[in-house]
């Protein structure tokens, strides 16, 4: 887990500048499963490739972000790129976190959770981070998790860091880190659910 | 339309198991949280936990931690209730809930199963 | 956990009187509110989420209000199938909980 988002990023990072520009305009107009939504044009335009991959997995999640992302570059007529992307994100997968009831098997979430829909603004506008990290520590993050985070020097690059390790988690972990949100920065949850 | 038809009454003896069931329609299983909620005669409510059908992820009431088992067969669109360790007190009716939706978690019961009574009797 | 505290619990009241129904949480909980009715042998009606807003085919007569730890629900004008038990819940944390109920009786 987590594999997925790696690959996206390290495929849109090697376009040029043109082919960036083009992926986005054809992601624009792509046809999507049933059930998805479009991200909105005027702030995919002006997003790099690291904002970009993160806004992919937050709107389509890893498994389809990077399927998605492989037909788009397909359709640009970057076959390779597509292909080492789809063979990245087939291999492994990641440990159940610490503490939560481990599903049988890993599946596709159907549904999209808030924690998920609203990554990128979660990570630009949290700042009671390390209250978070202390909510969340034993029962989502393991302690060498919880180091990492802690680690990181700002406030958006702890969650980012924080958010690097949700592909890995189930729904009920994403509660907990929502429940943690509505503790800390209620007002915060309620704007994005505003929005 | 949206159905939660639960299994019927049960009697246990103190210390046993129950396991009730919760079969769901008109909906996607995977798509939303399935709660369970007890309420013992003439009291109020009281909610044991749920289980997310999509991944299998449960979260449970730590009152309730190691006696109670939720579970999810998404073949049959079902989701299990186990309680162990059965008591007197845990004599009520067992109800199957699903929210008005997951997305933010907020867990607003809209729809319920017609609920399963349980008696424990010796 | 939050503790839920319902006041009070009986009221007696006539058809066309107004009811108000409160209920305490023993922390912030935010507008993270829900309201629901019972009757006998029947089980729980979702009338109010997230403290105020209506839930679908619930009459317009019900409305709640409140945010943080005080929360009301309102029954403007009484009707016969209204005399019920009523029971508040958070969704702000785990695990969730629910308010010990108020009957409301027929006077």
């Known amino acids: 887990m987590g594999r997925a988002r790696d690959a996206i990023l390290d495929a849109l990072e090697n376009l040029t500048a043109e082919e960036l520009k083009k992926f986005k305009l054809k992601l624009l107009s792509v046809p999507l499963r049933e059930g998805y939504g479009r991200i909105p044009r005027g702030a995919l335009l002006s997003m790099d490739a690291l904002d970009l991959t993160d806004k992919l997995v937050s709107f389509y999640l890893e498994t389809y972000g990077a399927e998605l992302t492989a037909n788009v570059l397909r359709d640009m007529g970057l076959q390779e790129m597509a292909g080492q992307l789809q063979a990245a994100t087939h291999q492994g997968s990641g440990a159940a976190p610490a503490g939560i009831q481990a599903p049988p098997q890993s599946a596709a979430k159907p549904g999209l959770h808030f924690i998920d829909q609203h990554r990128a603004a979660l990570i630009a506008r949290v700042t009671n981070v390390e209250w978070l990290l202390d909510a969340l520590y034993g029962k989502v993050l393991t302690d060498e998790q919880y180091q990492a985070v802690r680690a990181e020097p700002t406030n958006p690059s702890k969650m980012r860091k924080l958010f690097s390790f949700t592909p890995a988690w189930n729904w009920t972990c994403k509660d907990l880190l929502l429940q943690a949100l509505r503790e800390s920065q209620s007002y915060l949850v309620e704007d994005l659910e505003r929005s | 339309q949206v159905q939660l038809v639960q299994s019927g009454a049960e009697v246990k003896k103190p210390g046993s198991s129950v396991k009730v069931s919760c079969k769901i329609s008109?909906?996607?299983?995977?798509?939303?949280?399935i709660h369970w909620v007890r309420q013992a005669p003439g009291q109020g409510l009281e909610w044991m936990g749920y289980?997310?059908?999509?991944?299998?992820?449960?979260m449970y009431n730590e009152k309730f931690q190691g006696r109670v088992t939720i579970t999810a067969d998404k073949s049959t669109s079902t989701a299990y209730m186990e309680l162990s360790s059965l008591r007197s007190e845990d004599t009520a009716v067992y109800y199957c809930?699903?929210?008005?939706?997951?997305?933010?978690?907020?867990?607003?019961?809209?729809?319920w199963g017609q609920g399963t009574l349980v008696t424990v009797s010796s | 956990e939050i503790v839920l505290t319902q006041s009070p619990a009986t009221l007696s009241l006539s058809p066309g009187e107004r009811a108000t129904l409160s209920c305490h949480a023993s922390?912030?909980?935010?507008?993270?509110l829900s309201w629901y009715q019972q009757k006998p042998g029947q089980a729980p009606r979702l009338l109010i989420y997230?403290?105020?807003n209506l839930h679908t085919g619930i009459p317009a007569r019900f409305s709640g209000s409140g945010s943080g730890t005080d929360f009301t629900l309102t029954i403007s004008s009484l009707e016969p199938e209204d005399f019920a038990v009523y029971y508040c819940?958070?969704?702000?944390?785990?695990?969730?909980?629910f308010g010990q109920g108020t009957k409301l009786e027929i006077k």
């Open positions: 809930a699903r929210p008005l939706y997951s997305y933010a978690s907020y867990y607003w019961f809209a729809y």
């Open positions: 008109g909906y996607s299983f995977t798509d939303q949280t």
């Open positions: 289980i997310y059908p999509g991944d299998g992820s449960a």
């Open positions: 922390q912030n909980i935010n507008v993270y």
């Open positions: 997230k403290s105020s």
């Open positions: 819940q958070q969704g702000q944390s785990y695990p969730l909980t």
